[in-house]
Interface confidence: low
């Protein structure tokens, strides 16, 4: 800046007020003095013609930096812009992090919540199976109970059947009529004890005309040994009559009792036929003679055991095993109490 | 839509107790966290409590803890608030809310359903 001030200080001076040029003289004096004028002068003058050019370049330099500065300065000014916009960028960037975050924690929590409540009904599932497991085995025993009160009940009841039906039929008739049974089959039987019975009646207790066949007959006798004796003595008799005509004397027994014993029948009927001499034993058990002793099964599953250290046997009865067993538990019928 | 139906309220004693009850109609309450505001008169609209999803996450102010207890019933589809030990400062009207995504830390923006409100006063 002192420079600038130097200039235009000498800049003021115009050339009016500079002194015309004097003589030169020779003397070393004046010489001196002439030089020193004259290069003053000169000075002057000189200052008064570079100083434009080099106002010009000046202004010309500094135009160049004052360009310099302003396009750095813009540059400067994008560079903020820019940075800016960046920061509002991570600013929503971060927002949008802190709301996924959220997001995220909200569904992990609800995750949990839905976990909890899946592992909650889960465990209400398997309690829900487990219950259901032991009151199908509670049913399974309740009915096995039954039927073994029901066979117990039955125990000495006998049940004739193929008996014709008259008009007029009573207690006594059908008493009578059992007395003829045991006096035309079994006449030792009735020499040797005195037959007594609690009740005898047909069933179904109502009469119907439309019957193809006779209603049974139930004997419910005082002692369980007289049924049993019966039924030995009909067992080694063979063919049991009633005035000539054929019929039958069965054990009276539950409904699943017969059942159990019906579905032994294919396996019987093998068993007969290769003469393993079975047995259906009560209630509903079947024995035969396999390797020279009896054996007794309660069920198929139990046969079916027995049998697989036994090929022959297992070969034999394969099919009959295989055959897919009738629900052992119906729902109970009706049964004549006695 | 989701509606909510606010009930109970009334007019009760200082150190009373009163039981609040929102009914859910129109979606199924379990999709939902819920919650309670209040406003009182001339004040702003302030958080009470919340219930999660589930019910297994429960959050209250300050103002209400132990003596509110929010709870739900998702085969009902409602939600209660239970209020002892009321106070007179706990005059407001009492809004039901509902949320689609619950969070741990409530504001009044993050509630999508609001009921129309039911009036506690307490002498």
């Known amino acids: 800046m002192g420079k600038k001030q130097n200039r235009k200080t000498g800049n003021s001076k115009t050339q009016s007020a500079s002194p015309p040029p004097k003589e030169r003289s020779s003397s070393p004096a004046t010489e001196q003095s002439w030089m020193e004028n004259d290069f003053d002068e000169l000075r002057e003058e000189g200052f008064r013609r570079s100083n434009y050019s080099e106002l010009r370049e000046d202004i010309q330099t500094k135009g160049k930096e004052v360009e310099n500065f302003e396009k750095n300065l813009e540059e400067c000014i994008t560079r903020i812009t820019n940075t800016e916009k960046c920061l509002k960028e991570l600013m929503e960037l971060k927002t949008k992090a802190r709301e996924l975050r959220e997001e995220c924690r909200s569904l992990r929590s609800r995750c949990d919540q839905l976990e909890e409540r899946v592992s909650a009904m889960e465990d209400e599932m398997n309690e829900m199976k487990r219950e259901g497991k032991f009151r199908e085995k509670r049913i399974k025993r309740n009915e096995q109970s039954l039927q073994e009160i029901w066979d117990y009940v039955k125990r000495p009841n006998l049940r004739l059947i193929g008996v014709p039906e008259s008009d007029v039929e009573n207690g006594t008739k059908l008493e009578n009529t059992l007395q003829d049974i045991i006096q035309e089959n079994f006449p030792n039987l009735a020499r040797q004890a005195n037959v007594q019975i609690q009740e005898i009646q047909r069933t179904p207790q109502r009469y119907s005309s439309r019957r193809a066949t006779p209603r049974h007959i139930i004997v419910r006798f005082t002692k369980v040994e007289m049924k049993e004796k019966m039924l030995r003595a009909a067992r080694e008799k063979g063919r049991v009559t009633l005035k000539g005509k054929p019929i039958r004397l069965t054990a009276d027994l539950s409904a699943e009792t017969l059942q159990a014993r019906r579905e032994w029948g294919p396996i019987f009927n093998i068993l007969k036929e290769k003469n393993f001499q079975p047995r259906i034993s009560y209630p509903a058990k079947l024995s035969f003679i396999s390797e020279g002793e009896i054996k007794y099964f309660i069920d198929k599953q139990m046969l079916r055991d027995f049998v697989t250290t036994r090929p022959a046997l297992k070969e034999l009865l394969k099919e009959a095993l295989n055959m897919e067993r009738n629900n052992r538990y119906q729902p109970l019928q009706n049964h004549a109490k006695m | 839509q989701v509606q909510l139906v606010e009930s109970g309220g009334d007019l009760v004693q200082a150190g009373g107790s009163l039981r609040l009850s929102c009914a859910v109609s129109?979606?199924?309450?379990?999709?939902?966290?819920m919650g309670w505001f209040r406003q009182a008169p001339g004040k702003e609209r302030e958080f009470v409590s919340s219930i999660s999803w589930s019910g297994s996450r429960t959050l209250y102010s300050d103002s209400v803890k132990g003596r509110f207890t929010i709870s739900r019933d998702n085969a009902k589809n409602t939600v209660d608030l239970q209020m002892n030990s009321l106070k007179p400062e706990d005059t407001a009207v009492y809004y039901c809310t509902a949320v689609r995504e619950y969070r741990d830390y409530p504001q009044r923006d993050n509630f999508d359903y609001w009921g129309q409100g039911t009036q506690v006063t307490v002498s």
């Open positions: 129109g979606g199924t309450s379990s999709n939902y966290g």
